[in-house]
């Protein structure tokens, strides 16, 4: 008799999952020296105890502890990248510039970047028909409490100048909503981050409005103020430009329109 | 607009160092790549060094290992370390912003530097 299943509205666990997780870390392992250390597949079990037989809609921060425990990990607290909305702009940055981390260029972050997964109250089994979607169905989910996580963590670590990418073509350009609003911007700590530096990132070749003044920005602004945090905005009309000259800050081009 | 306001230069030894400051005001939210050049009696302007916001940095062949640019946390004050200088180091120094693809482009008045015995 095939046994019930709970049909959730998101896309259910990304195929190939255990393999994906495992393929991953030991490739990350290899390439960053000081992470060389961490075992994988108990990083592997680990990350399947937190969700592995426990109701999707029922996971908690303290599920994922093992996971955080296995993977902590140490990058320069003063060369933070957050981002909100424009992911792939943030990685192409840190790509070029390799002093600097996102969330994703950390273990834990690559493990999970753009995975999906969830298992069911009470089987082994994965679920990969299905998996609770943030809005539809609950918050508590896997992915959701894997990021908040993981964000929570990253933010804490912060220091002096913190920068945070953000994407200028949305109506919103900074998000109460986002994890960088919800979560990030709440657990920067005060007494070690002296400055969050928002860069706007422009999508029109003719925009040259000045995104800083945005009444989004400006509750960015109070926000951060009121948490005794300093505030500075950029403009970044051609992030295409901006990339060549993180590449070769040499080059004329930097400073002139050519 | 953007008003950019150097100090620091003067007179110094060969072998001697100064530390320039650039200070922004104004609409510095356009302010994304900050730089110095320098203009010696006689000769065009040339590139000395400049960083970009999240902290890249370029520098011309010829003050390389010499000299440093810095910015504070701020983001609106940058400098010039400049150490073992030498005689053919003497210019009209003059900060310089902008953003990369845009007609922002903005110049201090300069501040002399000579280096002599």
């Known amino acids: 008799v095939p046994r019930w299943r709970q049909q959730w509205s998101g896309p259910g666990t990304t195929k190939r999952f255990p393999e994906t997780v495992l393929a991953r870390c030991v490739k990350y392992t290899e390439i960053h020296p000081e992470m060389r250390h961490v075992d994988c597949q108990s990083v592997w079990d680990a990350f399947k105890g937190a969700f592995i037989s426990k109701h999707p809609c029922n996971i908690t921060e303290e599920d994922y502890q093992p996971l955080m425990k296995l993977g902590t990990q140490t990058v320069p607290c003063n060369k933070i990248l957050l981002w909100s909305r424009i992911k792939d702009l943030a990685h192409q940055f840190t790509q070029v510039q390799r002093d600097m981390f996102t969330l994703e260029d950390t273990l834990l972050g690559y493990l999970a970047d753009d995975l999906t997964w969830c298992g069911e109250f009470n089987t082994s089994k994965i679920n990969y028909q299905s998996c609770p979607d943030w809005r539809k169905d609950c918050s508590n989910n896997p992915v959701s409490v894997f990021w908040k996580t993981v964000s929570r963590r990253f933010a804490e670590a912060a220091c002096d100048v913190v920068h945070v990418m953000l994407n200028g073509s949305r109506s919103k350009i900074f998000d109460k909503n986002s994890t960088f609003g919800s979560v990030e911007v709440h657990n920067l700590q005060p007494e070690k981050v002296q400055t969050l530096e928002a860069w706007v990132i422009h999508g029109g070749r003719e925009d040259s409005r000045d995104l800083c003044q945005d009444p989004t920005i400006k509750e960015l602004e109070s926000i951060i103020s009121k948490r005794n945090i300093q505030f500075s905005c950029k403009n970044i009309y051609r992030p295409d430009k901006f990339l060549q000259c993180v590449k070769n800050p040499e080059d004329s081009s930097c400073t002139s329109e050519i | 607009q953007v008003q950019l306001q150097e100090s620091g230069g003067g007179l110094v030894q060969p072998g001697g160092s100064l530390r320039l400051s650039c200070v922004a005001s104004?609409?510095?939210?356009?302010?994304?790549?900050m730089g110095w050049y320098r203009q010696a009696p006689g000769k065009q302007r040339e590139f000395v060094a400049r960083i970009i916001i999240g902290g890249s940095t370029g520098y011309s062949d010829s003050v390389k290992g010499r000299f440093t640019i810095s910015r504070d946390n701020t983001g609106n004050t940058w400098y010039l370390q400049m150490n073992s200088l030498k005689p053919e180091d003497t210019a009209v120094y003059y900060c310089n912003a902008g953003n990369p693809g845009t007609r922002y482009i903005y110049w201090g008045q300069g501040t002399q530097v000579t280096v002599s015995s």
């Open positions: 104004g609409s510095i939210s356009n302010i994304i790549t």
